[in-house]
Structure formats: C-alpha cells, structure tokens
Interface confidence: low
C-alpha cells in the first residue's frame, strides 16, 4: 500500500503544456499539520450528564462501591505496521492480516497525564515509528499484537469526576523533518488504523475494558453495571485530502492503495511499479507508433503495470467526500498501451452499491490520454477504484496522474465523530445503552433493569411503585377528577397488578379535563438518539382525547408541542408499549399528560413504565438527526 501523500504535486495535467517539477516541502505548516491530525472532542455536556446520572457523590457511598472510570485510545496495528514494512521480531508479515487471535491481543502505551491536560486544555498524542514498534511489535521474539492502545484511564477518570469543559484529544504523526512525505504517510496510516476512544464506567464488580465473560453473577439487586463508550468517526476515516481534493502524480508516494500491492523497482513481479520517466525512455517502454522524443514528455515518475495473463489490477483512492456537483475523476494514461487492456472506474460509496463512472477520453500529446469521469456529489463518503483489466497474454499499462478535482466547495462537511454507548450484561452480552432501563429485560438476569435504573434522577425511570415520581397536578378543587397512582385490580388485569398513573373519566354533565406534569429533564445532547418510552392503556369508552405534550423552556418562554395523541377511543383493555423519538429538543423540558372528555365518557386512562432513554444524555450519533420517520413506534 502506498500510503503516503504528496502535498505539492504537479500543477495542471500532463496533456497541457510543460509540467512543473514536483516539489514537496520538508515540513508542514501549522494548518497542514492540523489537517494531519485526528481530533476527538467529547462535549462538556457528556461529562456533566455522566457525572449526574452515573456517579453518585462520593460521600454517599463507600469508596469500594464507587463506580470506576477507565479510558484508552486504540488503533489497529496492521495499517501502522504496513507503513514500517517487515521488522525483526514481527511474527506475521506486514502485508498479511494479523492472525485471528491478534484481534484480542493488545499492548498498552502510557497515555498523557492529567497535569498536561489541565495545562494545555487538550492532550496531544504523537505517534511515530518508535511508538508503533513499541505498541505493536514489542520486544524481539514476542508475537505482534492486533491493537495499539494508549492508557487514558487516569485522564478520563479525572475529567469525568473533576474536570471542566470538553475533553480534547489530538492524535497526530510525530514531527520529524528528516524524510520527505513522512508525516503525510504516517497520517494516512493512522487514519487507516481506525483510531477510537474507549471509555468505560462500571459499578461494583466489573473490572476491565475487555468483555467480561467469566464473571460471577451477583444478585440483580446488587449495584453492578458496566457501560462502555466508543468514540470514532461515524464514517470510515476520510482522508485529510478530502478537504482539498486529491492529485497524485506518483513522484512521491501517494495516498492510494494498489492491488496487487505496489512493488519497488527491484521487484519484477506482475504488479504496479513506480518508475522514473528517464528509465522508461531507456527501456523504450512508451514508444507508441509515431511517438517522438520531446522535452514535453512527462518528467518525474509514473506507474507502470506489466501483466502476464488475464488479470485485474486496481488503484483505490482514499475515502473522500464531495460537496460539489463538479467533482471529477481525471486519470492520465498512455494510450498506445491500451489496446491489450481497458480501464474501468467505479464509485464506491459507503454503505451503498458500487456504480461505474463513465470515462471520457481527452487525447493529449505523445500518446498520453486524460480519462475523465463525473463523480458529482454522492451523499455518503466514497472511494474511487480504477481497474485495469488486461485481456491478453502480455499487457502494459502506464498511469501518469490520478486526480479527484473540484470536489469541494469551500470547506468540506468533514467527518463527524460518533459516541456509541453500550451496556454489558454479566454474561458478556452487549446491549445498546438505550436498551438499559426501558422496563424490558434484555440481560439474562435482568441487570439492565436493576439498581442502576432506580438510582437515576426522579422521573427518568418510573413504574409508580413508589408514588408519583415527580409527576404533579395543579391545585385541585374537591370535585375535579384527578390523576391517581394506584393498582388496576381487576380480573382482566391479572398480568398487571402493579401501580400505574390512572385517570377515571366518569360520565359528566359538561366537559372536563385533567393535566399531570412530569419532573423537569435536562436538555438532551445534540444529535442524540433520544426517546421516551411508556405503556398506556384505555379501558372503556373515552368520549374525548388524551395528549402527551412536550414543553421546552426556551429562554424563559415555554413552548409546547404535542408528541402523542389518541382520541374517541373504545379501549381494548390492552397495555400498549410506545416509543417516542424526542427529536430537536434543545432545552430543558417536561412532559404533560392532558386528558379531555365529555358526556358519555366512561373510561380509565392509565400510564406506566415511563422512561427517558439514557441515550438522550450519553450517546452522540455521528450525523445530525434528520426529522423524518418520527412517528411513535407502538406495540401491544
């Protein structure tokens, strides 16, 4: 894999006028260095909510029973090792995948200190060859590992308990000005290694970032739980090139991947090779019919492919985004070598089917042709593959540059970091965090509905066993119907003998209404998959309606919107389960159940098992929520 990147590439296409000599700076400007970094920013609100919801004040619980916090930054070793090439003591070759067991093996390097973070307001982790060797290879003779990890437990633990502001961690290539293009190649390898932040907060009993498989199972009422977060790009890592477009003239290693892998000059196998034009001239490789020697012949290096049989060879771009309809692929190929093979370009969008890019040739001088194909503006990040399919016994292909042009209008949308959260059951089953504390037992022993849920702030998790849990009514006159917490004791409700929030709408001469208001909830984290879950039931005949209203406290003004409504209902006497997405809630909010009924109404309206998903406060979707498909999910 040629995973470096050229920065100062040739301007213009080889087809038009004398090309400039390629030039690459030895070191990067501050802005360019920033573009080589992978930045993790955990918002301050996450810290506030994690502290409030999961970490009780230390005075109220014994030290031994206090939840613990851990953190690490993990990278896959394979792309980093490929950059270094084979090294002594590595027990699997850099080009081949790690053995299966390496998936779980990791070596942990020391992360940054709290002192550093407090002083600089961000932690910068620099990754260079030495750290890669230490983290992925280790002492000679030891097996290579699959994961390189930086231990950030001390730092995360401090930040989540005592820190202020957001947590900023920047991972970047170590700064060394010795070798041309080195930082760029290292940056590409870092991105390919899918860096991710791992956080864990666990109550009494759990003790590692690994999956807890062989753990004793405490009783469900024991305060034991284990939450894990992974922060990573919500799309495969985008090349920093995607902000500027990609232009690769093969004079320096480029941020492209080659299949079969790129070979150096000494290796004569049938694969892509980078060769200087002078050598090609000496070998008469590019002497097509009528080709003349010229000072306008492309200088520098290009790719040559010498194939022996029917085969397929590919050049693959890094992940890109396009914010312009004018985004185009341009590839310069030597046309006299083409009759024995052909080029096919494919657009490979993330999570979508590949589609072909129609290539239009623009003939240039001295046998070179520029093939251009329109990419446009795909919705998702994408890669572009250029395949050369040879169709004879011997085939030659030469490529002088590969460019993705006009792909950005201003700044690209860039990638979005997602903070994915999960709950680990005692037996190792991993649930999405939203499945915890939802009154549905997903863990084998029910620990996802245990003590942790009952310790949440008032109103977050309510089955009305202990009263109204924060739901209140205005001052009531003695004759006004009111919401009550009591059991539905009745032969038809054998399955539901616990308490519920009830309203009895008896026959009245005039219309009546009754409102009950929840406790106030904090503003959900922006673009969290926030949901309200509850059971509801209407028994009898309701001549009227019941609404659930969400009221936001927007800068002192109260703004209400109806999120659920049922009208003129002949109750089935069945409990129905409902999940309501709470989208676009940006302020503190509360809920109101409003019932209105008129003459002839004889119904009981009941609500139970009301919960606000922990996702609202502890999960970040990578992409902003799109306001669609927001109808409540309902089931009996």
């Amino acid at each position: 894999v040629g995973s470096g990147m050229g920065t100062g590439q040739r301007a213009g296409s080889p087809a038009a006028g004398p090309p400039l000599q390629p030039r690459e700076p030895l070191s990067y400007s501050r802005l360019q260095r920033k573009s080589l970094a992978v930045d993790f920013v955990v918002p301050s609100l996450f810290r506030v909510y994690a502290r409030d919801l999961l970490l009780p004040p230390s005075s109220s619980e014994l030290k031994a029973g206090r939840p613990e916090a851990r953190g690490s930054l993990a990278l896959d070793c394979a792309p980093l090792l490929r950059l270094l090439g084979p090294a002594p003591g590595v027990s699997w070759t850099a080009g081949s995948p790690a053995p299966a067991e390496a998936r779980t093996l990791s070596r942990v390097l020391k992360g940054g200190s709290v002192r550093k973070l407090r002083r600089a307001k961000q932690l910068v982790l620099e990754l260079g060859e030495e750290a890669i060797l230490e983290g992925c290879v280790g002492p000679p003779g030891e097996a290579a590992v699959g994961l390189l990890q930086f231990n950030l437990s001390e730092l995360f633990s401090w930040w989540i308990r005592q820190g202020e502001g957001r947590l900023r961690i920047r991972l970047m290539p170590e700064k060394k000005a010795s070798e041309v293009g080195r930082e760029g190649r290292l940056s590409a390898a870092i991105r390919a290694s899918q860096p991710r932040l791992l956080f864990q907060i666990f109550g009494t009993g759990h003790s590692s970032l690994e999956s807890p498989t062989n753990m004793p199972s405490p009783s469900p009422d024991y305060f034991t739980w284990n939450l894990t977060w992974i922060m990573k790009d919500s799309f495969p890592f985008l090349s920093h090139r995607s902000r500027y477009g990609l232009e690769c003239s093969f004079d320096f290693p480029c941020e492209l991947e080659y299949s079969p892998p790129l070979h150096d000059l000494r290796n004569q196998s049938w694969s892509w090779r980078r060769i200087p034009s002078e050598e090609a001239s000496q070998m008469d490789l590019l002497d097509g019919p009528g080709a003349e020697r010229s000072k306008e012949m492309p200088r520098g290096s290009f790719l040559l492919l010498n194939t022996s049989a029917d085969s397929k060879h590919t050049i693959l771009s890094p992940w890109m985004r396009s914010s312009s309809e004018h985004c185009t692929l341009a590839v310069s190929v030597h046309r006299h070598l083409q009759p024995s093979g052909r080029y096919i370009a494919q657009l490979l969008p993330h999570n979508e089917a590949a589609r072909e890019i129609l290539l239009m040739p623009t003939p240039g001088k001295h046998g070179w042709t520029v093939l251009q194909g329109r990419i446009g503006r795909p919705d998702n990040p994408f890669r572009v593959a250029l395949e050369y399919i040879s169709s004879g016994n011997r085939s030659l292909s030469a490529v002088d540059f590969f460019a993705l042009k006009n792909c950005s209008e201003g700044t690209s949308p860039g990638s979005k970091m997602a903070l994915q959260s999960s709950f680990t059951c005692w037996n190792g089953t991993v649930l999405q965090l939203g499945q915890a504390c939802d009154f549905h037992q997903d863990c084998a022993q029910g620990e996802d509905e245990s003590q942790m849920c009952r310790k949440l702030p008032v109103g977050f998790y309510c089955n009305f066993e202990d009263g109204f849990c924060g739901w209140t009514q205005g001052t009531l006159s003695p004759h006004t119907p009111q919401w009550q917490v009591r059991t539905l004791k009745d032969a038809r409700f054998q399955d539901h003998q616990d308490h519920a929030l009830l309203l009895s709408t008896t026959d009245v001469p005039a219309s009546e209404s009754a409102t009950v208001t929840s406790a106030t909830f904090p503003a959900p984290i922006k673009s969290s998959p926030c949901e309200l879950r509850m059971s509801w039931l209407i028994r009898g005949v309701l001549r009227g309606n019941v609404s659930l209203v969400l009221v936001e406290n927007k800068t002192g003004k109260e703004q209400g919107r109806m999120v659920w409504h049922v009208a003129a209902y002949e109750g089935l006497s069945l409990w129905q389960w409902m999940v309501l997405p709470l989208l676009d809630v940006s302020d503190r909010f509360w809920l109101q159940m409003v019932a209105w009924w008129g003459q002839g109404s004889r119904a009981i309206v009941a609500f139970d098992n009301i919960s606000i998903s922990l996702d609202c406060y502890l999960t970040i979707s990578g992409e902003d929520k799109i306001l669609q498909n927001t109808a409540p999910k309902s089931r009996n």
Epitope: A100, R103, T104, S211, T213, N427, G428, T429, H440, D442, Q576, W577, K633, S634, R635, N636
Partner: antibody, heavy 120, light 107 residues
Amino acid sequence: QVQLQQSGAELVRPGASVTLSCKASGYTFTDYEIHWMKQTPVHGLEWIGTIDPETGGTAYNQKFKGKAILTADKSSSTAYMELRSLTSEDSAVYYCTRCYYGSSWYFDVWGTGTTVTVSS
Amino acid sequence: DIQMTQTTSSLSASLGDRVTISCSASQGISNYLNWYQQKPDGTVKLLIYYTSSLHSGVPSRFSGSGSGTDYSLTISNLELEDIATYYCQQYSKVPRTFGGGTKLEIK
C-alpha cells in the same frame, strides 16, 4: 458451497445427556454466530441460543438455560450443543443455523437437522 | 416473550394463484421480521429479511410487507415447488420467536 452438516439421529434414555454437532464448511466459521433451534409439533420452532465461535460468548433463551450448553471448536469449525437431563419434552428436531454479525438479524443457512428421541 | 401468531395454520391454493400469509406480533416489532420456508423433507430456507428484503437467490415472486404488529408474505404466482410450511420470526427482542407456521397445499 456453504453447508452446516449436523450429526445423525439420537435415541436416548430419560435423564441422560446428548451432544449434537454442527460442522460448518464453505465459509469462515468465526465470521458468523451459530444459533440453535428446537422444533416440535406442539411448540413449533423455538430459539435455544447462540454462540460466537470467535470469542466463545453465548446467549440463551431463558427457557433453555441449564438445559442446553453451547460450545464451539474453531480448529474443526464445529459447533456443539449438549442437552442435559433429558425428558420426553426434549424429543424434537434440533437445527443449527448461522447468522452474520453485520447483517440484519436473520438465519441465512440452516443445518440438516438432528432428530432426538427420548424414550425408555 | 413476544408472541408471533400465524392465524391460518393451513392454506389451499391453486397453481398460479396469488397467496398471502399473515403474521401478527403481540407487540410492535419495528419491521424486525424474517420469513422462512420449510420443505416437507425438513429443509429450511430464508426467504425475506427485515420485513421486505428478498434474500439472494430467492425468486422475485416472493415479497414481504407490513409494519407495527402486522406482517405478511405474498407469493404472486404460486408454483409447485412452493409447497411448504412458512414461518415468520421476530428479532426485535430476545428471545427470538417464531410463528406457528402456515402450511401451504395445492388444491
């Protein structure tokens, strides 16, 4: 092609145990979970549980906890289910199936089925 | 557990007919539903996953639809090889549960 080959029919005495096997071929064994199903005329198809051959992690239907023990051997690409303390209620056809982690949650390949008869 | 109910336990139809098999869940399952075909010899095949996605290699005469608690499998042009028992299965909650099956026979 992709196959899940199950062991042959078993006739066992009440109170005994039996181990059924499911040998995978034609795909990378550790890329898929193996799930087990029970089929009887009375209760139809029931999901017993699953094992991740890569990690050995398991999840069970509460109903079959203690009744079924799932294991897997990566080296032979074989999954096993041990059924304990057998009674006539355990007489059934048992299927192993595979389920890809990254996919929607479906069983795309099913084994041939093993008939277990519990009788004295 | 979520109960899956296939109200019609057996169904007779003629070759070329359009046949619909229904399945209902005891609570909403958010389209997390698959359909399987079991031949008389016991062979089981996946037909449809996630309510309406056709599994590879399955003829296009099979289609699925539904939402909430009610789902259906449709065979648009019944062929002899479609004689089998059809099962729905939900994967919204653990344990994954199946319907009782609908046996399809030729008139």
